[in-house]
Interface confidence: medium
């Protein structure tokens, strides 16, 4: 089995308030089995942004069809960005279990929010 890598190619993304932000994340292996989750921030204070297995997350949509078994693209789009959305977003693979356990994280993408153009 190929070792799982989680690739967040963008170190930073800048978006105007009110626009949508696309945060890219791809994985290189389907193993181990388990969901992908997105968080803003690291450590105990991090905030769940998207969980493949639960929801809804009204402002978050996946860029590709994540329900397809062979899907390796877990990029997300967050709509109607506000300054409160600024931060570092991590795409994290969990290993299936009871409960699911964190397996590997991407390096993170920093989202900055520009003022809405007048």
């Amino acid at each position: 089995e190929e070792e799982l890598q989680i690739i967040q190619p963008d170190k930073s993304v800048s978006v105007a308030a009110g626009e949508s932000a696309i945060l890219h994340c791809t994985i290189t292996s389907l193993f181990p089995v388990g969901p992908i989750q997105w968080f803003r921030g690291a450590g105990p204070a991090r905030v769940l942004i998207y969980n493949q297995r639960q929801g809804p997350f009204p402002r978050v949509t996946t860029v590709s069809e994540t329900t397809k078994r062979e899907n390796m693209d877990f990029s997300i789009s967050i709509s109607n960005i506000t300054p409160a959305d600024a931060g570092t977003y991590y795409c994290i693979k969990f290993r299936k279990g009871s409960p699911d356990t964190e397996f590997k994280s991407g390096a993170g993408t920093e989202l900055s929010v520009r003022a809405k153009p007048s």
Epitope: S12, A107, S112
Partner: antibody, heavy 119, light 108 residues
Framework: DVQLVESGGGVVRPGESLRLSCAAS????????MNWVRQAPGEGLEWVSL????????YYADSVKGRFTISRDNSKNTLYLQMNSLRAEDTAVYYC????????????WGLGALVTVSS | ETVLTQSPGTLTLSPGERTTLTCRAS??????LAWYQEKPGQAPRLLIY???SRATGIPDRFSGSGSGTEFTLTISSLQSEDFAVYYC??????????FGGGTKVEIK
């Protein structure tokens, strides 16, 4: 070859200002995030500030926030650090460091510029 | 912020010896860890990134390992030019980017 050359260091009194420059060559400057890292005499390395390639994303260490300003001029391939309200504890060698294109480690460093704050 | 603790603070060794330096993180940084070498009057030099990948031009006597919170840098056979200070740096939890306090490898 990648080259980073710092300049502008010197001796100042507490409360005074100084501006450091870092001239970059050997790579597409505007495509890379840049950082300042410092080292006080006899101490370890301390990250000071980073600026994204476009200049839109900027971060500072808490110890310098509100006093230091990082900026860049991509047309001149130059990184700057404006240091105001200097304190004795800011005395250090200040290094300009280029980030890798994918991750936040530093693949190239300058030789550093010595800043001494003393009354 | 993630705190990195390096040990020991100083190592006194002879050329040809094998040595292992340790870096511990206060929370998991996965494999987002780099090692640097610093000598007086020289620019710090990247040795290892991704916990175990050697940077361009780094001799294979340098190797890194570890993940999560525990990392090591091993120098298999010390050469005279390896006597220096070594720092680890995490780039998972950022900013701030944080460095360990350093380990000085000095000649016996």
């Amino acid at each position: 070859d990648v080259q980073l050359v710092e300049s502008g260091g010197g001796v100042v009194r507490p409360g005074e200002s100084l501006r450091l420059s870092c001239a970059a060559s050997g790579f597409t400057f505007s495509s890379y995030d840049m950082n300042w890292v410092r080292q006080a005499p006899g101490e370890g390395l301390e990250w000071v500030s980073l600026i994204s390639g476009s200049g839109e994303i900027i971060y500072y260490a808490d110890s310098v926030k509100g006093r230091f300003t990082i900026s860049r001029d991509n047309s001149k391939n130059t990184l700057y650090l404006q240091m105001n309200s200097l304190r004795a504890e800011d005395t250090a060698v200040y290094y300009c460091a280029k980030e890798d294109n994918r991750y936040r480690f530093f693949d190239y460093w300058g030789l550093g510029a010595l800043v001494t704050v003393s009354s | 912020e993630t705190v990195l603790t390096q040990s020991p603070g100083t190592l006194t060794l002879s050329p040809g010896e094998r040595t292992t330096l340790t870096c511990r993180a206060s929370q998991s940084v996965y494999t987002y860890l780099a090692w640097y070498q610093e000598k007086p009057g020289q620019a710090p030099r990247l040795l290892i990134y991704g916990a175990s990948s050697r940077a361009t031009g780094i001799p294979d006597r340098f190797s890194g390992s570890g993940s999560g919170t525990e990392f090591t840098l091993t120098i298999s056979s010390l050469q005279s030019e390896d006597f220096a200070v070594y720092y680890c740096q995490q780039y998972y939890d950022r900013p701030p980017l944080t460095f360990g306090g350093g380990t000085k490898v000095e000649i016996k």
